[in-house]
């Protein structure tokens, strides 16, 4: 009679994570008598997966009834597969011995490959806000996928970006992989409503890529422009001066009025108007009692936007003559003042 052979008909098996893997194995003879064991890997460090004779293997079930005397099918099923299960599985026939069974013959092995979906891409931007015309870096990360082949693309408002670098780790063989990509994005003044999108395509996603997004509203700071103007006289001794704060983002803004360098009033932007591009406008006014001043008054609108150093714009109010409509002009002091004008 021909010597027993252990047949593993499948050189490789590909299974999606979470599914059940079937590893087939048949023997060509009932002799010699002895159990079958399944191992992952070969050599002294191999891992026991299933032992017909003894042990508890909750994830493993046999395809046929191994208790039947004439059974020669030793195929197994492994449930709830994860990338950690990837490897080469060997079906090994043992010959009954005393005191221990002796390894008799091994199958050629079946390589189990696990297809695992990538995690949802996570996109993160710079630690602090940046202003228009600057290039900032965004990162995209996705983990736990297998096989290694993966495609990553970047978009800004639907337009594909080309300035990015991508790494898939580890470089060598692994049960699962991670992808890390860094894209450079140029901010514009119109980017408050913009989005940066990282798109990951993988064989496990069946043509439906995963996307991670970052809103540039979290990244951009659009500095305001300031304009101080004097309004027509309200009453004989009163002048209304307005400070227009335009095109700023985010909304966090505090405005201080100074009269000849002394704080007159401080307020926080609340009832702002929103522009189509997502930036804000705000106006503050100051009623100045001209009769309370002997000399010309230097009015300064000082703005602190989003925690940045304060910026200001000044207006000289002439009180020597009867107040009338005036335009903004520069200080007639001996040296530049300590306020910094935005323009």
């Amino acid at each position: 009679e021909e010597e027993l052979q252990v047949i593993q008909p499948d050189k490789s098996v590909l299974v999606a994570a979470g599914e059940t893997a079937t590893l087939r194995c048949t023997a060509t003879s009932l002799i010699p008598v002895g159990p079958i064991q399944w191992f992952r890997g070969a050599g002294p460090g191999r891992e026991l997966i299933y032992n017909q004779k003894e042990g508890h293997f909750p994830r493993v079930t046999t395809v046929s009834d191994l208790t039947k005397r004439n059974n020669m099918d030793f195929s197994i099923r492994i449930g709830n597969i994860t990338p950690a299960d990837a490897g080469t599985y060997y079906c090994v026939k043992f010959r009954k011995g005393s005191p221990d069974d002796v390894e008799f013959k091994s199958g050629a092995g079946t390589e189990l490959s696990v297809r695992a979906k990538p995690s949802a891409p996570v996109v993160s931007g710079p630690a602090a806000r940046a202003t228009p015309q600057h290039t900032v870096s965004f990162t995209c990360e996705s983990h736990g996928f297998s096989p290694r082949d993966i495609t990553l693309k970047w978009f800004k408002n639907g337009n594909e970006l080309s300035d990015f670098q991508t790494n898939v780790d580890p470089v060598g063989e692994s049960v699962s992989y991670s992808i890390h990509s860094t894209a450079k994005v140029v901010l514009t003044r119109e980017d408050v409503h913009s989005q940066v999108i990282c798109e990951v395509a993988h064989v496990t996603l069946q043509g439906d890529p995963l996307r991670g997004t970052a809103n540039l509203s979290e990244t951009i700071r659009v500095p305001p422009t300031l304009e101080v103007t004097q309004q027509p006289v309200r009453a004989e001794n009163q002048v209304n001066v307005t400070c227009q704060v335009r095109k700023f983002y985010p909304q966090r803004l505090q405005l201080t009025w100074l009269e000849n360098g002394n704080v007159s009033r401080t307020e926080t932007a609340s009832t702002v108007t929103e522009n189509k591009d997502g930036t804000y406008n705000w106006m503050s006014w100051l009623l100045v009692n001209v009769s309370a001043h002997r000399d010309d008054v230097k009015l300064t609108c000082q703005v602190e936007h989003d925690g940045q150093p304060a910026v200001s714009k000044s207006h000289d109010l002439k009180v020597s003559a009867h107040p009338k409509e005036q335009g903004s002009n520069t200080a007639a002091e001996n040296t530049g003042s300590n306020e910094r004008n935005i323009y």
């Epitope: 630690a127 602090a128 806000r129 659009v222 910026v311 910094r340």
Partner: antibody
Framework: QVQLVQSGAEVKKPGASVKVSCKAS????????IHWVRQAPGQGLEWMGD????????ANNQKFKGRVTMTRDTSTSTVYMELSSLRSEDTAVYYC????????????WGQGTLVTVSS | DIQMTQSPSSLSASVGDRVTITCKAS??????VAWYQQKPGKAPKLLIY???SLETGVLSRFSGSGSGTDFTLTISSLQAEDFATYYC?????????FGGGTKVEIK
Amino acid sequence: QVQLVQSGAEVKKPGASVKVSCKASGYTFTDYEIHWVRQAPGQGLEWMGDIHPGSGGTANNQKFKGRVTMTRDTSTSTVYMELSSLRSEDTAVYYCARAVSGYYAMDYWGQGTLVTVSS
Amino acid sequence: DIQMTQSPSSLSASVGDRVTITCKASEDIYDRVAWYQQKPGKAPKLLIYGTASLETGVLSRFSGSGSGTDFTLTISSLQAEDFATYYCQQYWTTPWTFGGGTKVEIK
């Protein structure tokens, strides 16, 4: 008081790279951009680019076609400007200067670093 | 890139003279214009920013004006320490650009 202190003069061969440092003090480093401006002997001023230490955001003069790399080390309040593939026409004094992002011109300047490119 | 055309490239003047330097931008740059003074072997010094705002510590004989594309630096009464080279610069859009400079020399 606000100070920007630059590294010392350098002599480089064509094709080499140079890295100039600019150490800031006297203000909150992450609130202001650091700009780089160069001036060839007897010539005018030329803006190279800037970096915002807070966000790491950079703006570059495309004339330099990727030869300029600006980095920052917030732990030492230092900005670095590296210029690669040097040629003789890169011989110049290189200045760093600070500005409030999006608002102001350059109000404080470093003392300048002379970079000489010669074979 | 925005071109900043500065004129004249040089001028000779005497102490006490009123000096005017002009700068023309190739496109609208709003009010984002600065003026610098540079003396030989020194870094530039900011005089005016935002077209007309005097930098802290700068004497009031320096003034700036203009808007849109046309800008002017005026020294009302030239002093001995004012002989230097002056540059205009736009900071509305990158790349930031400078004028070619105006060298103010003693007549």
